[in-house]
Interface confidence: low
C-alpha cells in the first residue's frame, strides 16, 4: 500500500464528493447545499433553490443558487422559456425578429440583440426565407411588378409606352 | 516535488498583527484544500484554519476565529494567513499544510516546514 | 470536537517492533484517523490513514515497515524492523464537521525513543 499518492472516496454509489473533510453525498440538480455530512459517506443537507434562481446540475459545492438571468428589453430580447429550479431563462427573439449577435465570433453565450425581420411582401418581393436580415435575401419581384434599380416596381397598366417583360400580363398586347 | 514553503513569521508585540504566506509549487495549486496548523513551544499540533480549493468553504478554530482571516491567490499559488490582535498564546511554529486533491477521505498529505511567530511584549 | 487519547511515550530496540495507539471518542469508534510522524525540530509528516475496517494508505515513500491496524475504537500504528531514523513523535488526527465548520483534531502525541 505505499505510495498512494491521496485517499479517494471509497463510499457506495457514484455521487459522493469530498466536502470539507468527509465524503458526501452531493445535492441534485435545482437545490443548493445548506450544510455538508458531517459523518464519512453521510448526506449533505440540501434545500430546493429559491424562487428566481436556479441551479442546472448535481452539485456539492454550491451554497447558493444563481440568480435567473433577465431577458434584456432594451435588446428586444423575450423569454422562450421561463427560468426554474433547474434552468436559467432561455433568452430569444419573438417571432418575426431575428438574432443579431453583438459579437464577431458567436456562440449560443454571445451577448446579442433582436431585430425585426424585412417585410419582403411590403417590399412587394416572393419571401424566400422564413425571416430575411436583407433585401437580398427576399425573392423576386411579386406579380405586378418589375426589378427596377434596387427595388420592385409596380408594373403599368396602362398599354401605351414600353411594357417591361415581366409585366406582359398586366400591361402587354392582349391578344 | 511537492514544495510547502512558509513565511511573515517573526516577533511581534500583544495586538499587532502579522501576515503569513505559504508558496506552492509542484502540484496544481488550485486543486487542493489548504490548512494552517501551529505547534506551540514542545506542545503538539493545533489546527488553525482551513480553505477549500475555490475559497468557498472557510473555517476556524475557536480560538482564533474573529481575528485571523485564511485566504488564497490560486493565480500566484499562494496561501495566506493574515493574524490580527495577537496575544501570547498564538506564539508557535505555523505549518501550512495540503489536503489531497481527490475526492474522498482526508488527510494533510504534504507539510511547510513551517514559520515561527513570537507574540511577546 | 471529538477526542483522540494517546499515551506519552513509548520506546523500542534497534530492529525490534512497537505499536502505537490512538483510542477515538466511543461515539466515533467508526471513523477514519491519520497518523503523522514528526522528527525533532521537523514538519510533520503523513504516513497513513487508517479506517475503522483497518484497511489503510500510506504515504509517499512510507516504508513497509509501517502499518496499521483497528481495533472497536483502537487505531494502532505498528512498526516493525525499528530503525534510528523512526525516532520521532506520533500525532494521530482526524477531521470533524461541525455545524458547518470544518476542522482537524490532533491527539497528544506519544514519543518514540529508540534504544
Known amino acids: 500500500q505505499g505510495g498512494t499518492r491521496s485517499p479517494r472516496c471509497d463510499c457506495a454509489g457514484d455521487f459522493h464528493k469530498k466536502i470539507g473533510l468527509f465524503c458526501c453525498r452531493g445535492c441534485p440538480a435545482g437545490h443548493y447545499l445548506k450544510a455538508p455530512c458531517t459523518e464519512p459517506c453521510g448526506n449533505s443537507t440540501c434545500l430546493v433553490c429559491p424562487q428566481d434562481t436556479f441551479l442546472a446540475w448535481e452539485n456539492h459545492h454550491n451554497s447558493e443558487c444563481a440568480r435567473c438571468q433577465a431577458c434584456d428589453e432594451q435588446a428586444s430580447q423575450v423569454a422562450l422559456e421561463n427560468c426554474s429550479a433547474v434552468a436559467d431563462t432561455r433568452c430569444g427573439c419573438k417571432p418575426g425578429w431575428f438574432v443579431e449577435c453583438q459579437v464577431s465570433q458567436c456562440v449560443s453565450s454571445s451577448p446579442f440583440y433582436c431585430q425585426p425581420c424585412l417585410d419582403c411582401g411590403a417590399l412587394h418581393r416572393h419571401t424566400r426565407l422564413l425571416c430575411s436580415r436583407r433585401d437580398t435575401d427576399c425573392g423576386t419581384c411579386l406579380p405586378g411588378f418589375y426589378e427596377h434599380g434596387d427595388g420592385c416596381v409596380s408594373c403599368p397598366t396602362s398599354t401605351l409606352g414600353s411594357c417591361p417583360e415581366r409585366c406582359a400580363a398586366v400591361c402587354g398586347w392582349r391578344q | 516535488e511537492v514544495q510547502l514553503v512558509e513565511s511573515g513569521g517573526g516577533l511581534s508585540q500583544p495586538g499587532n498583527s502579522l501576515q503569513l504566506s505559504c508558496e506552492a509549487s509542484g502540484f496544481t495549486f488550485s486543486n487542493h484544500d489548504l490548512n494552517w496548523v501551529r505547534q506551540a513551544p514542545g506542545k503538539g499540533l493545533e489546527w488553525v484554519a482551513y480553505?477549500?480549493?475555490?475559497?468557498?468553504?472557510?473555517s476556524y478554530a475557536d480560538a482564533v476565529r474573529g481575528r485571523f482571516t485564511i485566504s488564497r491567490d490560486n493565480a500566484k499559488n499562494s496561501l495566506f494567513l493574515q493574524m490580527n490582535n495577537l496575544k501570547s498564546e498564538d506564539t508557535a511554529m505555523y505549518y501550512c499544510?495540503?489536503?489531497?486533491?481527490?475526492?474522498?477521505?482526508?488527510?494533510?498529505?504534504?507539510w511547510g516546514q513551517g514559520t515561527q511567530v513570537t507574540v511577546s511584549s | 470536537q471529538p477526542v483522540l487519547t494517546q499515551s506519552p511515550s513509548a520506546s523500542a530496540s534497534l530492529s525490534g517492533s512497537v505499536k502505537l495507539t490512538c483510542t477515538l471518542s466511543?461515539?466515533?469508534?467508526?471513523?477514519?484517523i491519520v497518523w503523522y510522524q514528526q522528527r525533532p525540530d521537523k514538519a510533520p509528516k503523513y504516513v497513513m490513514y487508517?479506517?475503522?475496517?483497518?484497511?489503510?494508505s500510506k504515504g509517499d515513500g512510507i516504508p513497509d515497515r509501517f502499518s496499521g491496524s483497528s481495533s472497536g475504537a483502537h487505531r494502532y500504528l505498528s512498526i516493525s524492523n525499528v530503525q534510528s531514523e523512526d525516532d520521532a513523535t506520533y500525532f494521530c488526527?482526524?477531521?470533524?464537521?461541525?455545524?458547518?465548520?470544518?476542522?482537524?483534531?490532533f491527539g497528544s502525541g506519544t514519543k518514540v525513543t529508540v534504544l
Open positions: 488526527g482526524m477531521g470533524y464537521t461541525l455545524a458547518n465548520q470544518y476542522g482537524w483534531v
Open positions: 487508517l479506517k475503522s475496517d483497518g484497511s489503510h
Open positions: 466511543s461515539e466515533l469508534s467508526n471513523y477514519t
Open positions: 480553505i477549500s480549493s475555490a475559497s468557498g468553504l472557510i
Open positions: 499544510a495540503r489536503d489531497p486533491a481527490y475526492t474522498g477521505l482526508y488527510a494533510l498529505d504534504f
